[in-house]
């Protein structure tokens, strides 16, 4: 038997992936566990094997179909169970009725690129990945720029309160190396959270033109 506190948290990427983390104090690392998904109005079931990510937590991804296929809707409920092998049988460790569109976490934005760079400004664009068409334009973004000598945690957050897949960074220092990241969040869902940060995009501002003597 396993004692201690347990937590089972899952997010839907809005298309065909449910990612889950199960944590259990005092659980054995070598225990074989899985997540089982049982939708209330679909003919499919899905299972993934929980793999350790730390001393007392395990994670897995339920792949529901092709990455851009719309496998669930706002009316779906998926019963999710954590099952761990105990001898010859499987024991249910955790259970929840999961409402996918109340628990959204999108994939990190992709395809970041510098559209135009000058001495003091830089225009950057990106794309969202595997995001449901249900959202239409109901998305928001956060962006941050890493300046020399600073950490990502110190970088001020820039908020884009609409579906805008570009930004113009201003008041930059000439001939300076920067890095840029962006993340996305749907407006829908009580437990919805920000996507992971995108891969950093490195860019350098142009040097200032040499001034002429007057």
């Amino acid at each position: 038997a396993v004692n201690g506190t347990s937590q089972f948290t899952c997010f839907y990427n809005s298309r065909a992936n449910i990612s889950c983390v199960w944590s259990q104090d005092g659980a054995l690392q070598d225990t074989s566990c899985q997540v089982h998904a049982w939708p209330d109005r679909r003919r499919w079931n899905q299972t993934c094997e929980l793999l350790p990510v730390s001393q007392a937590s395990w994670a897995c991804n339920l792949i529901l179909g092709a990455p851009d296929s719309q496998k669930l809707t706002t009316v779906d409920i998926v019963t999710l169970r954590v099952l761990c092998r105990e001898g010859v049988r499987w024991r249910v460790m955790a259970i929840q009725d999961f409402k996918p569109f109340e628990n959204l976490r999108l994939m990190a934005p992709i395809s970041l690129q510098v559209v135009h760079v000058e001495t003091h400004r830089c225009n950057i664009s990106w794309e969202i990945s595997q995001a449901s068409h249900y959202f239409e334009r109901h998305l928001e973004f956060e962006a941050r720029t890493l300046s020399p000598g600073h950490t990502w945690e110190e970088a001020p957050l820039l908020t884009l309160k609409q579906k805008q897949e570009w930004i113009c960074l201003e008041t930059l220092t000439p001939d300076t190396q920067y890095e840029f990241q962006v993340r996305v969040k749907p407006l829908q869902g009580e437990f919805t959270t920000w996507s992971p940060w995108s891969q950093p995009l490195a860019f350098r501002t142009k040097p200032a033109a040499l001034g002429k003597d007057t």
């Epitope: 038997a1 089972f8 019963t79 024991r91 249910v92 955790a94 259970i95 929840q96």
Partner: nanobody, 126 residues
Framework: QLQLVESGGGLVQTGTSLRLSCAAS????????MGWFRQFPGKEREFVAA????????VYVDSVKGRFTISRDNAKSTVYLQMNSLKPEDTAVYYC???????????????????WGQGTQVTVSS
Amino acid sequence: QLQLVESGGGLVQTGTSLRLSCAASGHTSRINAMGWFRQFPGKEREFVAAISRNGGSTVYVDSVKGRFTISRDNAKSTVYLQMNSLKPEDTAVYYCTATDAVGWTTRWMTADFGFWGQGTQVTVSS
């Protein structure tokens, strides 16, 4: 270990009431949801009702909604099933069950429950 002992079954007339009780002993602090299943002769056990750890959530099979009520008294480590307007088709062996699984669902299955009582016979005569 955890033990569950049912009581309150018996033979009753159609339209009357019966209250089943289930007392838990042993490691009762591990219990989360508790519930009742029933088994008709030659059939699989079927879910009847369940109640969450704090009693705030309950769920019933459609055939007993409005007639049966599940409740629990955590201080006494006991769960109850109040059965009103009984019908001959309610005749079955009723099993108390408990789980230490964390969380809640409205779609309980037999495999969700790791602890079972011995069962108590309920017979409804017409």
